[in-house]
Interface confidence: medium
């Protein structure tokens, strides 16, 4: 079959843009750390890089292969307000490289971490 | 309370980076359109803009207020392979503006669309 080169180029571009790689995302601080329901953060979210995008096959999953940690200062507010907003410094995982891994490998990796 | 102004600025910057706005995301074509399980797309994902980020309050949700549609050409593969990959042009929703809306308003909006 003969395909229009423009179509091939645009498809190739789509592959590139959707590949598994670190992407800037907004994460909810409270949900990330499972904090008490009477504790709030301002801002409620922080911007970090996490692995995202798509893999070429159903059996693969986009996973981080290396991680750095970013310290960010936020205001913590505890209700009832015994004091004003308190600046707190929290460390967030920041994915620096990613790879499409088989879901079985991911399962093994996660379970080996849990077992430690 | 005395606050370090550098911290105040970095906190404000975090608000900025995590605000509700159109963000480039990778979406799974098959999942987006709920296609038959024997149909695959190459690439399996496309890059579009969708509303994302955080709102200042629990009761608010980041929602699109305007949408454009992008046409993208992909290869469609149907199993068993009766023919080679077939180029198909599909239209994808691309969010162009967003707003933090109350979850009640979002519910009403979604239900008014369903009712039509």
């Amino acid at each position: 079959a003969h395909y229009n080169t423009e179509i091939l180029k645009s498809i190739d571009n789509e592959w590139r843009k959707t590949q598994c790689m670190p992407r800037e995302v907004s994460i909810d601080v409270g949900k990330e750390f499972g904090v008490a329901t009477n504790t709030f953060f301002k801002p409620p979210c922080v911007s970090v890089y996490r692995c995202g995008g798509c893999c070429n096959s159903e059996g693969l999953q986009c996973m981080n292969t290396s991680t750095s940690y970013l310290s960010k200062t936020l205001f913590e507010i505890t209700v009832p307000l015994s004091q004003g907003p308190k600046p707190v410094t929290i460390s967030f995982a920041n994915h620096t490289s990613c790879r499409c891994m088989s879901k079985l490998d991911v399962y093994r990796q996660v379970h080996s971490i849990i077992r430690r | 309370a005395h606050y370090n102004t550098e911290i105040l600025k970095s906190i404000d910057n975090e608000w900025r980076k995590t605000q509700c706005m159109p963000r480039e995301v990778s979406i799974d074509v098959g999942k987006e359109f709920g296609v038959a399980t024997n149909t695959f797309f190459k690439p399996p994902c496309v890059s579009v803009y969708r509303c994302g980020g955080c709102c200042n309050s629990e009761g608010l949700q980041c929602m699109n207020t305007s949408t454009s549609y992008l046409s993208k050409t992909l290869f469609e593969i149907t199993v068993p392979l009766s023919q080679g990959p077939k180029p198909v042009t599909i239209s994808f929703a691309n969010h162009t503006s967003c707003r933090c809306m109350s979850k009640l308003d979002v519910y009403r909006q979604v239900h008014s669309i369903i009712r039509r």
């Epitope: 801002p43 | 309370a1 005395h2 606050y3 370090n4 102004t5 550098e6 105040l8 600025k9 906190i11 404000d12 910057n13 608000w15 900025r16």
Partner: antibody, heavy 122, light 107 residues
Framework: EVQLVESGGGLVQPGGSLRLSCAAS????????IHWVRQAPGKGLEWVAV????????YYADSVKGRFTISADTSKNTAYLQMNSLRAEDTAVYYC???????????????WGQGTLVTVSS | DIQMTQSPSSLSASVGDRVTITCRAS??????VAWYQQKPGKAPKLLIY???FLYSGVPSRFSGSGSGTDFTLTISSLQPEDFATYYC?????????FGQGTKVEIK
């Protein structure tokens, strides 16, 4: 061209109220913090309050906390200073000033309005 | 609150003179110091930010230095338009505080 124009000053009795406005133009209003700084006749400069029009974050000098409220209307590119329970020592020229840039590490006021005089006297 | 103490409170100088104004913070303020020039009946103008960075459009005869608690504003060669009052300001913590000012007069 960046411009800040204050208005709303005048003579008011002790215990009275006044609302100052600061109309901003020539820049993206939500990209900079907006401060109010005052100067009593023949005296030095005193910082009063600040707002981030972007996030709505506000901070005040202890001398005005609970009496003054800073706010911003992003649709009008205008910051306000609502002054209640005014005292004789609040008499001053009130300037609104723009913070140099949200990306700079610290506050520094790069553009100032012409000032508006507030006189608190019976 | 952090106190900013300027010295001298006034000085007399001639055109072409090198002028130095100092500012001392009551505690460490890193490099979070700005300098302003104010003329009678006018709003202040930013000269220096973050202790040593010359603000855009400000003549290069103005310079700033220092970190921690001791800061200096220098005018290398005083010009007629430089006769004014100069203020230092710390913005390391809230509230930002100003020095009491240094009036530079014609000798």
């Amino acid at each position: 061209e960046v411009q800040l124009v204050e208005s709303g000053g005048g003579l008011v009795q002790p215990g009275g109220s006044l609302r100052l406005s600061c109309a901003a133009s020539g820049f993206t209003f939500t990209d900079n913090w907006i401060h109010w700084v005052r100067q009593a006749p023949g005296k030095g400069l005193e910082w009063v309050a600040v707002i981030s029009p972007y996030s709505g974050a506000t901070y005040y000098a202890d001398s005005v906390k609970g009496r003054f409220t800073i706010s911003a209307d992003t649709s009008k590119n205008t910051a306000y200073l609502q002054m209640n329970s005014l005292r004789a020592e609040d008499t001053a020229v009130y300037y609104c000033a723009r913070d140099a840039d949200y990306k700079y590490a610290f506050w520094a006021f790069d553009y100032w309005g012409q000032g508006t005089l507030v006189t608190v006297s019976s | 609150d952090i106190q900013m103490t300027q010295s001298p409170s006034s000085l007399s100088a001639s055109v072409g003179d090198r002028v130095t104004i100092t500012c001392r913070a009551s505690q460490d303020v890193s490099t979070a110091v700005a300098w302003y020039q104010q003329k009678p009946g006018k709003a202040p103008k930013l000269l220096i930010y973050s202790a040593s960075f010359l603000y855009s459009g400000v003549p290069s005869r103005f310079s700033g230095s220092g970190s921690g608690t001791d800061f200096t504003l220098t005018i290398s060669s005083l010009q007629p338009e430089d006769f004014a009052t100069y203020y230092c300001q710390q913005s390391y913590t809230t509230p930002p505080t100003f020095g009491q000012g240094t009036k530079v007069e014609i000798k």
